[in-house]
Amino acid sequence: IIPVEEENPDFWNRQAAEALGAAKKLQPAQTAAKNLIIFLGDGMGVSTVTAARILKGQKKDKLGPETFLAMDRFPYVALSKTYSVDKHVPDSGATATAYLCGVKGNFQTIGLSAAARFNQCNTTRGNEVISVMNRAKKAGKSVGVVTTTRVQHASPAGAYAHTVNRNWYSDADVPASARQEGCQDIATQLISNMDIDVILGGGRKYMFPMGTPDPEYPDDYSQGGTRLDGKNLVQEWLAKHQGARYVWNRTELLQASLDPSVTHLMGLFEPGDMKYEIHRDSTLDPSLMEMTEAALLLLSRNPRGFFLFVEGGRIDHGHHESRAYRALTETIMFDDAIERAGQLTSEEDTLSLVTADHSHVFSFGGYPLRGSSIFGLAPGKARDRKAYTVLLYGNGPGYVLKDGARPDVTESESGSPEYRQQSAVPLDGETHAGEDVAVFARGPQAHLVHGVQEQTFIAHVMAFAACLEPYTACDLAPRAGTTD
Amino acid sequence: IIPVEEENPDFWNRQAAEALGAAKKLQPAQTAAKNLIIFLGDGMGVSTVTAARILKGQKKDKLGPETFLAMDRFPYVALSKTYSVDKHVPDSGATATAYLCGVKGNFQTIGLSAAARFNQCNTTRGNEVISVMNRAKKAGKSVGVVTTTRVQHASPAGAYAHTVNRNWYSDADVPASARQEGCQDIATQLISNMDIDVILGGGRKYMFPMGTPDPEYPDDYSQGGTRLDGKNLVQEWLAKHQGARYVWNRTELLQASLDPSVTHLMGLFEPGDMKYEIHRDSTLDPSLMEMTEAALLLLSRNPRGFFLFVEGGRIDHGHHESRAYRALTETIMFDDAIERAGQLTSEEDTLSLVTADHSHVFSFGGYPLRGSSIFGLAPGKARDRKAYTVLLYGNGPGYVLKDGARPDVTESESGSPEYRQQSAVPLDGETHAGEDVAVFARGPQAHLVHGVQEQTFIAHVMAFAACLEPYTACDLAPRAGTTD
């Protein structure tokens, strides 16, 4: 498919001249950021970004790659080096420590320097590192965490928790010996480490005692509370703040977000991770875009500004399943949340960053025709005279041998939301990838986001832009219209 | 392996504070660029950059990812959308048209708008688009092309040629019907379309008549001249310029580059593509770094400045073979050339860009320990109880079934320069990938390289920075010390 207008050199020359004009007009703002938003696409490597752009464009009846994601419109880009101190290819815990606390840690640890060792409780104390969210709170800002995973998951936990094991969601997940040594589960830390104004995502079951039925799935014992200590953490959290509200469904969320008496909001919409966007019950569960909007409505009331973490956390899960359909539709919803946030905030006073914690071994090749489905087949056949998809994985559960050979695939099979793209190596879960990821930046001090940087740089840019510790002497003019 | 100093948060905080300090000091130069250099890593997607960084670092006895490539030091980064007008995943011809001419074309065409059709000679005329190199020459600058492939290959050809078929290297490759219609082979266009001051790379056989023995392989008929028209294009080129010199080996190149009487230099060091760096005969063939240095010595004599295209063209070939060792060692030599060029030029007057034309379906996963070989095995076993490598391909010739199953692999096998990493789909040649690639920029107007851009933007930035057509009214101050 060749669009007629693109056959004319003028089309490209005009477009590039406009882009140059926009580039020339870019003026680094010398003001501080009142608000900080970090959008974290978990597992959203560059290949995921491009594939999602095409899919989002095609959903709007375009050919695809010529269209723009919301994040594509951010004026500044850097590359982020994601390795952890102990691994070339990291996990979401060590990376969260990097981009939220500004310090690299070890694989599967959270909020701790690399002096801490995975699963060794006694290496926790003294090695805690403090997140930018925590520092923002101390500076009088409102703070929030929004995610499509459990709110106790590795990425959001980087904003508030310190743990040698990212899997210690509730006390039931913490070995008795570690509990005795004083190591707290992540859910406990969520409500006790710091005052978080908005908490939205999944993870109900980790907040309630074992035997507590889940409100959405009351007959399903496996979805009920998991806690062994008998604590109702939601109740404890509500008791801390007079204007606190707990919600567990979309209707309640929308009501609470418009209620001026609500000062603190916790919304937990699933027992564990939230459902994939394509499986979401839109009457019961809010979308990531809706959660982001609700968070912004509450947080933006604070004249001192806010810090908000927004995670598209299940992009990663789709990839781990080798189900690109899930990963890419999650990426589109993530991008929709970015777009909505952009409409609700001003780049005059809000530094917005979009990045990934790491990538995935996910590729998009095979020379497909422009406008063809991102989930489709490559032109021609493979060496084994069978079709193959343009999307593939290096490793993962999509590896199958049928009668000692690679299975054939049709366009209708590969387009299914359940289809697992093939991989070179059979694994239960496809792995992360270690290549640099993009950082997109907009707003005050966004121009500092440049070149190739360590992932830790992200936290430092946020702290500096908002004159938070250790950059309180930031020497930046307050943003225009500050009310503080 | 956990470096002790990295266990201390101060290590990361200090490092980030330094990076922030450097970012704050970045001042966009308001001057024009006297010189333009574009370094093109063919097939050098972000996964290749990261893997090469680790390998280069480990060759210096470091753990790897914490080190810097020369390109990593460039202060500005953008992402480039590489699709061609007709394909989501492009080839090196259409992409060369984009980044060298500023207009997107169709798959496998070069220097033509998308109104031209692959292999249809009669769609050539009237659809030619003019490269930045050509415009630089018209503005009085010296110009050069350096590559590790044939100089008639798709990427370098984008600087000087217009062809509906990238494979028309010599007239022997052009169908008689197309020759009759007036379509010229790329080698002919190399010497006749424009005056190129420096031409260095492979591609001897396309310049000489059939039956002409190759000077390096005189007994090997397959390496000799291929031309059917009886023309000796080297002789014709030499006749055009009084100070022209033709060389075919390293010794002659080094002599010529230091000879002030040489104004034009053509060095063709292999009949076809140059050898991979790891196979290069260091007495006969120059490295990419040496060719780059030679080109800069000649070109920098011009007080009006120069345009130089430098291609690490065989990164791509290594990937097509699914031999990551070759791809990554080529990338390191490419980076070495960038480093050397940086030493020989000044960022006060030279805009240097580093980019890729496209990526490859190449991934780096599996959670390997820091410091472990990039060519090594992932920890643990796959589902089939066999080892697997951290580097893998989505498709390509590394797919093998042994007795109806995926072959096992040892660390020593995977570390071999000849090892082909496994892939999900068996193809004769691994394919390009369609995700965005990085653009690294340094020098005057480098700050314009920002955000997510069409690949065409690259050509326009170069043209604008040097006030070339269509940006002669660029309104930029001449660089300091201009002698024009």
Epitope: - | K275, H279, S282, H317, V400, E418, R420, P426
Partner: antibody
Framework: EVQLVESGGGLVQPGRSLRLSCTAS????????MSWFRQAPGKGLEWLAL??????????EYSASVKGRFTISRDNSKSIAYLQMNSLKTEDTAVYYC??????????????WGQGTLVTVSS | DTQMTQSPSSLSASVGDRVTITCKAS??????IAWFQYKTGKAPKLFIH???TLQPGVPSRFSGSGSGRDYTLTISSLQPEDIATYYC????????FGQGTKLEIK
């Protein structure tokens, strides 16, 4: 002109060792892969060992049949490749050839061979 | 390791005959196959590499073809001086020879 000359062959008793040498000339020795092959009486050609070039760290590879007994090495200052053969067996009796690889079409083609040296393992 | 199965092991043909020798690899060898002529008491001589590229000085009656796992050496018109043993060699992954084909004149 590329030349490869093998030496060091001869009669040796089973269980003993022998070192073969391959003296190279006419090319930049450090840039090339060197290999050893053999042909036993009445048998086919067999690859034994390979040593790579400077650019690839002079890494080595062996066929399963000789791994652990034979060692390939090189003295780059003298442009000599060696094959150290230990624990020799009667079935190691063969003509041993030294070869240099040339990279054509990016494959390691065995374009250059020495004339061979005879090794006889017998008691 | 890649195995090479060469056939036939011996072949008797008349001068002027078209002779074909085949080699099958245990896996795809990406056209990295060479053919050697071996005469007793001499070093093996490279005749063809990369499936079909003739070495300098090799008569044009010799040709090679194939792809994937299957490869062929053809002598279009057998000459007396062609009497020798021919070996295929894969060099995609290290080196492996075929068992050889002894060519004789009837």
């Amino acid at each position: 002109e590329v030349q490869l000359v093998e030496s060091g062959g001869g009669l040796v008793q089973p269980g003993r060792s022998l070192r073969l040498s391959c003296t190279a000339s006419g090319f930049t020795f450090t840039d090339y892969y060197m290999s050893w092959f053999r042909q036993a009486p009445g048998k086919g050609l067999e690859w034994l060992a390979l040593i790579r070039n400077k650019a690839t760290g002079y890494t080595t590879e062996y066929s399963a049949s000789v791994k652990g007994r034979f060692t390939i090495s090189r003295d780059n200052s003298k442009s000599i490749a060696y094959l150290q053969m230990n624990s020799l067996k009667t079935e190691d009796t063969a003509v041993y050839y030294c070869t240099r690889a040339s990279f054509y079409y990016d494959g390691k083609v065995l374009a250059y061979w020495g004339q061979g040296t005879l090794v006889t393992v017998s008691s | 390791d890649t195995q090479m199965t060469q056939s036939p092991s011996s072949l008797s043909a008349s001068v002027g005959d078209r002779v074909t020798i085949t080699c099958k690899a245990s896996q795809d060898i990406n056209k990295y196959i060479a053919w050697f002529q071996y005469k007793t008491g001499k070093a093996p001589k490279l005749f063809i590499h990369y499936t079909s590229t003739l070495q300098p000085g090799v008569p044009s009656r010799f040709s090679g073809s194939g792809s994937g796992r299957d490869y062929t050496l053809t002598i279009s018109s057998l000459q007396p001086e062609d009497i020798a043993t021919y070996y295929c060699l894969q060099y995609d992954n290290l080196y492996t020879f075929g068992q050889g084909t002894k060519l004789e004149i009837k």
